[in-house]
Amino acid sequence: KAMHVAQPAVVLANSRGTASFVCEYASPGKATEVRVTVLRQADSQVTEVCAATYMMGNELTFLDDSICTGTSSGNQVNLTIQGLRAMDTGLYICKVELMYPPPYYMGIGNGTQIYVIDPEPCPDSD
């Protein structure tokens, strides 16, 4: 593979449908601008969940309507995906691109299997 990207094999979303995992990459050099993309792979279909470009040392900025948030520390990105439901269970791949300075490097992780269990509805109480 290209650049090494590591991520946990399995994560369980909490009862509020939030899952967090760390995406760590081995940078060949001193990148100042990094792009992180989360991809969901299901039935050989790959869709982009969210993406953020950040300057090293700064916060990740996802689009306002994104279901992802994140923080960065060195070559680690802490990603949180919110609003997940059981149907969103699947393999979430972390893709990292070193955008600046050139040369361009990219890599993808092996994916994190996120399991989401919908909470049981509260029983009616009289």
Partner: antibody, heavy 115, light 107 residues
Framework: EVKLDETGGGLVQPGRSMKLSCVVS????????MNWVRQSPEKGLEWVAQ??????????YYSDSVKGRFTISRDDSKSTVYLQMNNLRAEDMGVYYC??????WGQGTLVTVSA | DIQMTQSPASLSASVGETVTITCGAS??????LNWYQRKQGKSPQLLIY???NLAEGMSSRFSGSGSGRQYSLKISSLHPDDVATYYC?????????FGGGTKLEIK
């Protein structure tokens, strides 16, 4: 200004050896993976070999067509990457480019294999 | 190994036209695709990196798109200076295979 300057090409007989060098300036050599890519009329562009840098333990990778015959190496103190080519064949003929990542390319050096 | 299939192998177009070159990968390369321009007698030059990003110093008339296994390079408002051979390359995993090239000529 980024410069990659390849030297060492020329005419060589089949079965013989040749060593190419590439001196780099204008970007941080030690921060980058270096490659050799060759160009021939028959095959177009063909990646030949890659050497990664210290964070990647100077790992080396080769195309199947040169594995066991070619050796890529680097000297970070001289900002130079080398390609040792042994047991050369007619199909190894072409212009050999040294590249930084795949962003920066040298001007190329011509390798001719002929009896 | 990932195979890259480029088409067409050659094309001829008039100045001012828009042309599209396509590149297919034998498996998903997750946007790990570069495009290069090689003019006669010159070294290849990086044109597009990461499928969609324009390399420094290259004209904005060039644009890249695609994902998964299918990618394309669009050249808008063709200039005589665009005469060259264009190559795609897989940059996801070794071996870093190139497409066969597309030779662009001006009518």
């Amino acid at each position: 200004e980024v410069k990659l300057d390849e030297t060492g090409g020329g005419l060589v007989q089949p079965g013989r050896s040749m060593k190419l060098s590439c001196v780099v300036s204008g970007f941080t050599f030690s921060d980058n993976w270096m490659n050799w890519v060759r160009q021939s009329p028959e095959k177009g562009l063909e990646w030949v070999a890659q050497i990664r840098n210290k964070p990647y333990n100077f790992e080396t990778y080769y195309s199947d067509s040169v594995k066991g015959r070619f050796t890529i190496s680097r000297d970070d103190s001289k900002s130079t990457v080398y390609l040792q080519m042994n047991n050369l064949r007619a199909e190894d003929m072409g212009v050999y480019y040294c590249t930084g990542g795949f962003t920066y390319w040298g001007q190329g050096t011509l390798v001719t294999v002929s009896a | 190994d990932i195979q890259m299939t480029q088409s067409p192998a050659s094309l001829s177009a008039s100045v001012g036209e828009t042309v599209t070159i396509t590149c297919g990968a034998s498996e998903n390369i997750y946007g790990g695709l570069n495009w290069y321009q090689r003019k006669q007698g010159k070294s290849p030059q990086l044109l597009i990196y990461g499928a969609t990003n324009l390399a420094e110093g290259m004209s904005s008339r060039f644009s890249g798109s695609g994902s998964g296994r299918q990618y394309s390079l669009k050249i808008s408002s063709l200039h005589p200076d665009d005469v060259a051979t264009y190559y795609c390359q897989n940059v996801l995993s070794s071996p870093w295979t190139f497409g066969g090239g597309t030779k662009l000529e001006i009518k």
